[in-house]
Interface confidence: medium
């Protein structure tokens, strides 16, 4: 007779990342008896929800249920039926919903309410939908990457998780770039965190961490682009905007109503005597970079040192993992290699932005034009943000590691969020034996 495999004693968790531009569903899995160990939780599935971010459903909330269906059905397939009722589901909304809430708490609540009702219809253990703070987003991203890198384990590891990993217990800083906000989180070296809003204290696995974090709302790549356009059209005072951040020959008509729809452009708002304007690309990295720098106010700083807009930033310390859009954009531009210096990145961006739009479309025929057209801006913005915004230098650039996944799990805030909400990161070091190597798939 054939041996029947013993049922796996595993647990699952689901986190939906409701970002400004889209929603993604992540399914995590871990051995039930090892849930307090570090490094045991791993991602088994990512499902990208078709369509925009949930904040865009404000005028059509009745469509939210259908919008979430495909990915929730996928979760139903991936997770064994016997586990459905024990599987927690969390939805965290980020900066897109923070912006909507700034405009109208009532509208934001209405969207979340419909999201909650839709998710409650599934056979999982729904734990709620909420807008997480920028501080949480930064903190959970930091927890995720350090958990996956094994930085919280006090035991000496006998294998290396990632090629750029250092074998010490120094944590990595986290750099997260979304569509509407960007977060910087790290442990400063013996530095007082001068601004209480930016200070976090954690005790994880028996060790204390004093962490600096800040989330810059409106400085995600999409909102930064809206800001730049709103700033530039003020000066252009014309129905045509020659824009160095788009490829030569690129043309696009923008509605002024769309430009001023977001709270991020309010500071640049003016009465324009036209309803639309046309962007005409001129593809010049240097000019694009200069234009982006005008979004960062570096003249005001009430602390010993600042990032921009008067926000305290301690001296950078150690290695950093740059993920989410930092990774996606740099991956597209083929600039994620550890060997590519900052000078080389700049040179390659100059060449890329100068390429004619028709040539770019031919070279990247499979990429949606909406995304393709914005890589010149996004790449230039990433350089501007890291160098002038966060004060990385040509030398410290080599401490930035563009990370998509670590051991098969996406770098981002969702894993850290779930670990926290399921109490899977103990304050004290658990008394358990090391995992066998085979546990890491």
């Amino acid at each position: 007779t054939q041996n029947k495999a013993l049922p796996e004693n595993v647990k699952y968790g689901i986190v939906l990342d409701a970002g400004s531009s889209h929603t993604s569903l992540y399914i995590y899995k871990w051995p039930a008896e090892k849930e307090n160990d570090t490094g045991v939780v791993h991602q088994v599935e990512e499902c990208r929800v078709k369509g925009p971010g949930i904040s865009k459903f404000v005028q059509k909330v009745n469509e939210i249920g259908i919008y979430l269906t495909d990915c929730m059905e996928r979760a139903r397939e991936v997770i064994p039926r016997s586990q459905h009722q024990e599987t927690p589901v969390y939805l965290g909304a980020t900066a897109g919903m923070r912006l909507l809430r700034m405009e109208s708490e009532e509208l934001a609540d209405r969207v979340l309410d419909v999201v909650e009702r839709s998710l409650s219809n599934y056979p999982f253990d729904f734990q709620g939908a909420r807008i997480i703070t920028g501080q949480e987003e930064g903190a959970y991203g930091w927890i995720t990457i350090n958990y996956l890198l094994g930085k919280f384990s006090q035991k000496t590891r006998w294998f290396s998780i990632v090629p750029y990993e250092t074998n010490n217990q120094e944590t990595f800083g986290a750099l997260d770039l979304g569509g509407a906000s960007t977060q910087v989180t790290f442990v400063p070296q013996n530095q007082t965190i001068e601004s209480p809003d930016n200070a976090l204290q954690f005790r994880l696995y028996g060790k204390d961490y004093n962490v600096y974090t800040h989330s810059f709302l409106c400085y995600g790549k999409d909102q930064a682009l809206w800001q730049k356009l709103a700033k530039d059209i003020q000066v252009a005072s014309n129905e045509i905007l020659r824009d160095p951040c788009f490829h030569p020959g690129y043309k696009k008509v923008v509605n002024v109503s769309d430009l001023y729809k977001t709270p991020c452009t309010k500071r640049f708002e003016m009465t324009l005597p036209f309803q639309q304007f046309e962007i005409q690309g001129i593809g010049n990295y240097q000019q694009c970079h200069q234009s982006i720098l005008e979004l960062f106010n570096t003249s005001y700083c009430p602390y010993s040192q600042c990032a921009f807009n008067g926000i305290f930033l301690p001296p950078l310390q150690g290695d950093f993992g740059a993920f989410s859009a930092f990774y996606f954009v740099m991956k597209f531009l083929n600039l994620t290699s550890e060997k590519v210096s900052q000078e080389k990145v700049t040179e390659m961006m100059k060449k890329f932005c100068a390429q004619p739009w028709e040539e770019i479309k031919t070279s990247y025929a499979g990429v949606k034009e909406k995304y393709l057209s914005e890589y010149c801006f996004s790449g230039t913005y990433i350089l501007s943000l890291l160098l002038q915004g966060y004060h990385f230098t040509a030398d410290s650039w080599e401490h930035i590691h563009f990370i998509g996944k670590i051991q098969g799990s996406d770098a981002g805030w969702t894993l850290g969020y779930m670990l926290n909400l399921t109490n899977m990161i103990p304050a004290e070091q658990p008394l358990s034996t090391p995992l066998s190597h085979s546990t890491y798939v």
Epitope: D232, V235, S237, N238, I240, R242, F274, N284, Q287, E294
Partner: antibody, heavy 119, light 107 residues
């Protein structure tokens, strides 16, 4: 080759009117905003007026507001400056210049046409 | 209105000499500044835009720079055709305003 050629200048009595023209060639006129700038004898440059590519925006210097009107005919590639209630201090060489943010802000100028307001 | 204070109003220099002209803005103009050259016959030519970008066809001896609200035009080695009037122009807001001009003469 980009060319801007002003015409219509001359001698006018105070209180009189005159219309200046600027003929454009060598570029897509309908894409560009256009300016009038003047220079009084032995003085520096003074901005006078601006009109956007589609004529929806018009800006004027306080010194000419209510007296001067800027207009354009995109079909004929021509810019105009209608001047009324002229004063002696309007005596100057009048230049037209084209404008397109980011890289073509007042990048090409005409050679100028002279207006003299005198009794 | 934004005032552009240009200095010096005139300067005498010899061929091959290095000269610098400065414009100070009364309010933030964020690098929205052109440098123009006006020849004795009245012809006006833009040399620099966005504070530091050289126009195509303009000799490399011309350069523009910015330090806070001060903007400079430098000619590294004067040539005979450089003797002219120079103006700065801000285009950060309306009304557009010019500096008072600098006359560069042969010593």
């Amino acid at each position: 080759e980009v060319q801007l050629v002003e015409s219509g200048g001359g001698l006018v009595k105070p209180g009189g009117s005159l219309k200046l023209s600027c003929a454009a060639s060598g570029f897509t006129f309908s894409d560009y905003g256009m300016h009038w700038v003047r220079q009084a004898p032995e003085k520096g440059l003074e901005w006078v007026a601006y009109i956007s590519s589609g004529s929806s925006i018009r800006y004027y210097a306080d010194t000419v507001k209510g007296r001067f009107t800027i207009s354009r005919d995109n079909a004929k590639n021509t810019l105009f400056l209608q001047m009324t209630s002229l004063r002696s201090e309007d005596t100057a060489i009048y230049y037209c210049a084209r404008d397109l943010y980011y890289d073509h802000v007042l990048d090409y100028w005409g050679q100028g046409t002279t207006l003299t307001v005198s009794s | 209105d934004i005032q552009m204070t240009q200095s010096p109003s005139s300067l005498s220099a010899s061929l091959g000499e290095r000269v610098s002209l400065t414009c100070r803005a009364s309010q933030e103009v964020s690098g929205y500044l052109n440098w123009l050259q006006q020849k004795p016959d009245g012809t006006i030519k833009r040399l620099i835009y966005a504070a530091s970008t050289l126009d195509s066809g303009v000799p490399k001896r011309f350069s523009g720079s910015r330090s806070g609200s001060d903007y400079s035009l430098t000619i590294s080695s004067l040539e005979s055709e450089d003797f002219a009037d120079y103006y700065c122009l801000q285009y950060a807001s309306y009304p557009r305003t010019f500096g008072g001009g600098t006359k560069v003469e042969i010593k």
